[in-house]
C-alpha cells in the first residue's frame, strides 16, 4: 500500500479535512515539473516565476536574464524560442488552439544584440508553425499551408511551397488524422543536424471525405466546421516527403524522397523522419494494413541532387500476431557511425526490447531482455545508452531510468533511479543536455513529484529543480485516500489494478465501487503516479472505492496481452473489467448493489459495453465522448487494431462491436451519456447514434451535451461536467448531498 503523503499522527486527525470537489475544480493540489530547456551541454533556459527568461550555466553556477518579463509583456508573449546562435529570440503570442497539438500564433523576433524587435520583413500572421534551424538563425515557418524560409530574421522570406490550400494541401504541417494518430505533433518538417537541408511532408487531402458539424457561437446562424477526416475504410491522405537545400533554396527546389517499392504498391502512411547526418536521412513508412513497417535510410547524391534510398538500406519490421509496434512504430536512435541504430521492437518472446541493428533486422543484437518492456530510448552517446523500462520489482506501471555502458564489453546495466527516492519516486522521465553531459529527472510519483538535476557522467544529484514544497504543505491537513497497486491472476491473464480507498477504509465494511476505465490498445491506467483528481475526491469525501484495471489490450506487459484485442475491439477489454469487478466483490468490502463504471473516449466505449453486458453487475455508469461504432472513428487508429470494414476483411466485427447493437441491454442500468457537440476527434455522431438507438428501443437514459466543446470538455464545461457526474453517482449510490 502506498500512503500519499506520509501520514500525520492520529492526534492531529481532527484538524484534517477531506478533499472537496471545489479543490479539484480549482486545481488547488496541482503539481509542477521542471524540464530544462537545454541549449548546450551545460546550459539551459527556464522561465522564472516572474516570467523572465533566465539562462543557467551548471558548471559556473551563474545565471542571468536573457529576456526580461517587460519585453515578454510588451507583445503579450506566452512562449519563446532562442536561436542556436543566441542572437535572436522568437516571442509567441495570440495563441489560438486548433486540434490536439496544433495552434496558430503571432511571432515577433527580438534581436538580443541590440535589444530591439526586428523591423522590416516582419512575419505574417497567424503562423501555423515556426522553428529555428539547429545551427545559426535561419527560420522555417508555415503560413496558410505553405512553407517559407528566412536566411536571417530580417531577410525577406523565400517561399518553398506554393500549392498549400486550406483543407486540401498541407505542407510542413499535418492534416487532422496525421496530427492525431500518426505524428502526434503540430509540425511535419525537420531540419538536418546542421541546417543544410529541410525535409517536409506534403499531405494531399483532396479526396478525403469531410466531417461537418455546427459550431453555434453567438451569431444568428451557426458556422459549419469542415475537416477532412478519413473514417475507417475511407480514402486516406496522400503523403509525399520532400527535401530542400536551404543554402540555395530557389535553385534545385524540393526533391522528393522515394517511397520503398514494397510500401508504394498499396495504400501507405509515412510515420516519421529522423535525420542521421546532413546528408543522410531515415524515413519510416507503414502499410495501410499496419502490420508491416519499413525503415528506409537515404543518402544525398550531389551529382543528381537527389536522395537515394537503396534497397540494402531498407529494414522491414513485421508483426504476425498484431500490428507493427506499440501505439506507434518506434523510432530509431542512431549511433555515432551514422548507419547503425538502436530501436525498440518485439523480441522472440513477445516483449518490446532494445535491439541494435548494424546491417539487417534479422541480425539485430538484442540489448535488453526479460519479461518486462523497454519503453523509451532517451539518448545514445559514445559510451552509454539511457532508456526507461518497467523492469524494477516487476511492476509494469513503474518507469525507471537505466544506463547501459555500450563502450565496454560485455555491456553493463545500471538503474539510475531505482533507489533514489524509492517510496516517493517510482515513475520517472528524463531530459538530457547535449552529449548527455547533464540530465534532469522528473519523478511523477507515487509521492509528490520532484524534479532533480544530475551529472551525466557520475549520475550524482546536483540540485533539486522543483520539489513542490507548497503542495506538500497544502496537503498536510488533507485526508488523502490510500492507494494500492496489486494484481489478479485469472485464467493465465495478469490483471493489474489500482485501488483508491477512502482514508478511513475498513475492510469489514461495504463500500460503493466505481470503476474508472480507459482500456484502449497500448494504453496503461495502472501507473505509480501522483494525482489529486476527481476520483481522489470521490474516495476522500464520498467514501467510494475506485478501481482502475489494465486488461487485455493494454501495454508494457508483452505482446500476448497487447495483441489479444487485435481485430476484435470491444470484447476482451470489457470482459476483463467485469472479471476484475467479480474479484473485487470476492474481497468482501464492496457493496455489490452499488457498483458503477465510467470512462472517457475509448473508456466511454468500454463503460457503455460493460453496462450493456447483461451481467447485472453495474447499477449505473457514465460514458463521456464515447466511440459507439468503429466505423465512425479515424482510419489510422481504427484500422491499426481492427483491419478494414469490408466484407472480405473485418466488417462483421465492426458491426458486432457497436454500442447501438446492445441498446436493449441498457434497460436495467442508469446510463449517463455525455458529449461535446464540437468534438473533432470522437464526433458527436457517436453519441447521437447511441441516443437514437436507445430511443428506438424505448430505453430511458440521461444525457448531457456541451455546446461548442471538443473532446476535452475544457473551461467552465469541466466544472459543470464533474459536478453533474458527481450528482449522478451520488444519486446512484444513494449518498446524501
Amino acid at each position: 500500500i502506498v500512503l500519499r503523503p506520509s501520514r500525520v499522527h492520529n492526534s492531529e486527525e481532527n484538524t484534517m479535512r477531506a478533499l472537496t470537489l471545489k479543490d479539484i475544480l480549482n486545481g488547488t493540489f496541482s503539481y509542477k515539473t521542471f524540464f530544462p530547456n537545454w541549449i548546450s551541454g551545460q546550459e539551459y533556459l527556464h522561465q522564472s516565476a516572474d516570467n523572465n527568461i533566465v539562462l543557467y550555466n551548471i558548471e559556473t553556477g551563474q545565471s542571468y536574464t536573457i529576456l526580461s518579463n517587460r519585453t515578454m509583456k510588451s507583445v503579450n508573449a506566452s512562449n519563446y524560442g532562442l536561436s542556436p546562435d543566441r542572437q535572436f529570440v522568437y516571442l509567441e503570442s495570440d495563441y489560438s488552439k486548433l486540434w490536439r497539438y496544433s495552434y496558430t500564433a503571432t511571432y515577433y523576433i527580438y534581436d538580443l544584440s541590440n535589444g530591439e524587435f526586428v523591423r522590416g520583413n516582419e512575419l505574417p500572421r497567424p503562423i501555423q508553425y515556426l522553428c529555428w534551424s539547429p545551427v545559426g538563425s535561419k527560420l522555417a515557418y508555415v503560413y496558410q499551408n505553405n512553407i517559407y524560409l528566412k536566411q536571417r530574421p530580417g531577410d525577406p522570406p523565400f517561399q518553398i511551397t506554393f500549392n498549400g490550400r486550406e483543407n486540401k494541401i498541407f505542407n510542413g504541417i499535418p492534416d487532422w488524422v496525421y496530427e492525431e494518430e500518426m505524428l502526434a505533433t503540430k509540425y511535419a518538417l525537420w531540419w538536418s543536424p546542421n541546417g543544410k537541408f529541410l525535409a517536409y511532408a506534403e499531405f494531399n487531402d483532396t479526396d478525403i471525405p469531410v466531417i461537418a458539424y455546427s459550431y453555434y457561437g453567438d451569431e444568428q446562424y451557426p458556422r459549419t466546421i469542415n475537416i477532412p477526416y478519413p473514417k475507417a475504410g475511407a480514402k486516406n491522405p496522400v503523403v509525399r516527403i520532400f527535401i530542400i537545400d536551404t543554402t540555395y533554396p530557389a535553385y534545385v527546389g524540393p526533391q522528393e524522397v522515394p517511397v520503398p517499392a514494397m510500401i508504394a504498391s498499396s495504400d501507405y502512411y509515412f510515420s516519421w523522419l529522423t535525420w542521421v547526418t546532413d546528408e543522410r536521412v531515415c524515413l519510416q513508412w507503414l502499410k495501410r494494413v499496419q502490420n508491416v513497417s519499413v525503415l528506409s535510410i537515404c543518402d544525398f547524391r550531389e551529382d543528381w541532387q537527389t536522395w537515394d534510398c537503396p534497397k540494402t538500406q531498407e529494414h522491414i519490421e513485421e508483426s504476425r500476431t498484431g500490428w507493427a509496434g506499440g501505439f506507434f512504430v518506434s523510432t530509431p536512435v542512431f549511433s555515432y557511425d551514422a548507419i547503425s541504430y538502436y530501436k525498440i521492437f518485439s523480441d522472440k518472446d513477445g516483449y518490446k526490447h532494445i535491439h541494435y541493428i548494424k546491417d539487417t533486422v534479422e541480425n539485430a543484437i538484442q540489448i535488453t531482455s526479460g519479461k518486462w518492456e523497454a519503453i523509451n530510448i532517451f539518448r545514445v552517446t559514445q559510451d552509454s545508452l539511457f532508456y526507461s523500462s518497467n523492469e524494477f520489482e516487476e511492476y509494469p506501471g513503474r518507469r525507471n531510468i537505466y544506463r547501459i555502458s555500450i563502450g565496454s564489453y560485455p555491456p553493463s546495466k545500471k538503474c539510475v533511479t531505482c533507489h533514489l527516492r524509492k517510496e516517493r519516486c517510482q515513475y520517472y522521465t528524463a531530459s538530457f543536455s547535449d552529449y548527455a553531459k547533464y540530465y534532469a529527472l522528473v519523478c511523477y510519483g507515487p509521492g509528490i513529484p520532484i524534479s532533480t538535476l544530475h551529472d551525466g557522467r557520475t549520475d550524482q544529484e546536483i540540485k533539486i529543480l522543483e520539489e513542490n514544497k507548497e503542495l506538500e504543505n497544502a496537503l498536510k491537513n488533507i485526508q488523502l485516500p490510500k492507494e494500492e497497486i496489486k494484481k489478479l491472476e485469472v485464467d493465465e491473464i495478469t490483471l493489474w489494478y489500482k485501488m483508491i480507498l477512502p482514508p478511513q477504509f475498513d475492510r469489514s465494511k461495504k463500500y460503493p465501487l466505481l470503476i474508472q476505465v480507459y482500456g484502449g490498445p497500448c494504453s496503461q491506467s495502472v501507473r505509480s503516479v501522483f494525482a489529486v483528481n476527481w476520483i481522489s475526491y470521490l474516495a476522500s469525501k464520498e467514501g467510494m472505492v475506485i478501481a482502475l484495471v489494465d486488461g487485455r489490450g493494454t501495454a508494457f506487459q508483452g505482446d500476448k496481452l497487447l495483441y489479444a484485442v487485435y481485430r476484435k475491439l470491444g470484447v476482451y477489454e470489457v470482459e476483463d473489467q467485469i472479471t476484475a469487478v467479480r474479484k473485487f466483490i470476492e474481497m468482501g468490502f464492496i457493496d455489490e448493489k452499488r457498483i458503477a463504471i465510467w470512462g472517457w473516449s475509448y473508456g466511454g466505449y468500454v463503460s457503455s459495453l460493460a453496462l450493456a453486458s447483461g451481467t447485472g453487475l453495474f447499477k449505473c455508469g457514465i460514458a463521456v465522448a464515447p466511440v459507439s461504432s468503429w466505423e465512425y472513428y479515424a482510419s489510422v487508429y481504427t484500422e491499426r487494431f481492427m483491419g478494414l470494414p469490408t466484407k472480405d476483411d473485418n466488417l462483421e466485427h465492426y458491426k458486432n462491436s457497436t454500442v447501438m447493437a446492445r441498446a436493449e441491454y441498457f434497460r436495467n442500468v442508469d446510463y449517463l451519456l455525455i458529449h461535446g457537440t464540437a468534438d473533432d476527434n470522437v464526433h458527436f455522431q457517436n453519441s447521437a447514434q447511441i441516443a437514437k438507438a436507445l430511443v428506438n428501443a424505448q430505453v430511458d437514459f440521461q444525457a448531457m451535451w456541451y455546446s461548442d466543446q471538443n473532446h476535452g470538455l475544457s473551461g467552465l464545461s469541466t466544472n459543470h461536467l464533474y459536478t453533474h457526474m458527481t450528482h449522478f453517482l451520488k444519486q446512484c449510490f444513494s449518498l446524501s448531498d
Epitope: A250, Y251, G253
Partner: antibody, heavy 120, light 107 residues
C-alpha cells in the same frame, strides 16, 4: 530592363576548351536574387540545360557534363562565364545564357544566343 | 532523369483556331513545369511557370494546366505571331530537362 549578352569564339577545335562569357546589364549579379544559367541548342534539335551559378560562386550543372563544365562569376564586371573542356562535334550548338529564378519561376530573361561550332 | 514527351510533334492550324499542346512526364513533376516559346533565330521566351502561371507580359490567350505527369498548354485563339516551337521544361527532379518541342505551323 535586364539584358544578357553572350560572347566568345564561334569556332573551337575538338579536344580544346570552349569559353563563353555572359555580360549582364540592368541587374546586378551580386544582388544575390538570381542564379545565372547556360542552355544550349544543337542544330535542329531541342534545348539542353548545362548549368547555373550563384553570385557566391556556388554551381549546379548537368551530371552528364560534370567533369567537363566549369562556371565562374565576376561580380566586379557583372559577368559570368562557362568553360567546357574536351569538346567534340556533339558540342556544336547555339549557347544561351539566361537569368534563372529557380525551380518555381524558371528562366525568365535570355540572351540572344551565340553559335559555337566545334570543328578542326 | 525525367523524360518529357511532347505531342504532337507538329500542329498545323489556322490563325484564330485553338491550339492544345501536350507534355507528358515519365514520372510526377508536381506542378514544377514551365512552357517556353521559340521563334526561328530567337532565344526562347518564358510563357508559363508552375504549370499554370503566366509570366510577365504574356497575353491571356496563353494558359497552362495540369499537375503530376500530364500538362497542357492552350492558346485559345492563335495570332500570327504565335506560330513557333514550344518547349516544356520540368524543374521537379534533377537535372532540369526539356521536352523535344512541338512546332505550331500555319495550315
Amino acid at each position: 530592363q535586364v539584358q544578357l549578352q553572350e560572347s566568345g569564339p564561334g569556332l573551337v577545335k575538338p579536344s580544346e576548351t570552349l569559353s563563353l562569357t555572359c555580360t549582364v546589364s540592368g541587374d546586378s549579379i551580386s544582388s544575390g536574387s538570381y542564379y545565372w544559367g547556360w542552355i544550349r541548342q544543337p542544330p535542329g534539335k531541342g534545348l539542353e540545360w548545362i548549368g547555373s551559378i550563384y553570385s557566391s560562386g556556388s554551381t549546379y550543372h548537368d551530371p552528364s557534363l560534370k567533369n567537363r563544365v566549369t562556371m565562374s562569376v565576376d561580380t566586379s564586371k557583372n559577368q559570368f562565364s562557362l568553360r567546357l573542356s574536351s569538346v567534340t562535334a556533339a558540342d556544336t550548338a547555339v549557347y544561351y545564357c539566361a537569368r534563372d529564378r529557380g525551380y518555381y519561376y524558371n528562366m525568365d530573361v535570355w540572351g540572344q544566343g551565340t553559335t559555337v561550332t566545334v570543328s578542326s | 532523369e525525367i523524360v518529357l514527351t511532347q505531342s504532337p510533334a507538329t500542329l498545323s492550324l489556322s490563325p484564330g483556331e485553338r491550339a492544345t499542346l501536350s507534355c507528358r512526364a515519365s514520372q510526377s513533376v508536381s506542378s514544377y513545369l514551365a512552357w517556353y516559346q521559340q521563334k526561328p533565330g530567337q532565344a526562347p521566351r518564358l510563357l508559363i511557370y508552375d504549370a499554370s502561371n503566366r509570366a510577365t507580359g504574356i497575353p491571356a490567350r496563353f494558359s497552362g494546366s495540369g499537375s503530376g505527369t500530364d500538362f497542357t498548354l492552350t492558346i485559345s485563339s492563335l495570332e500570327p505571331e504565335d506560330f513557333a516551337v514550344y518547349y516544356c521544361q520540368q524543374r521537379s527532379n534533377w537535372p532540369p530537362t526539356f521536352g523535344q518541342g512541338t512546332k505550331v505551323e500555319i495550315k
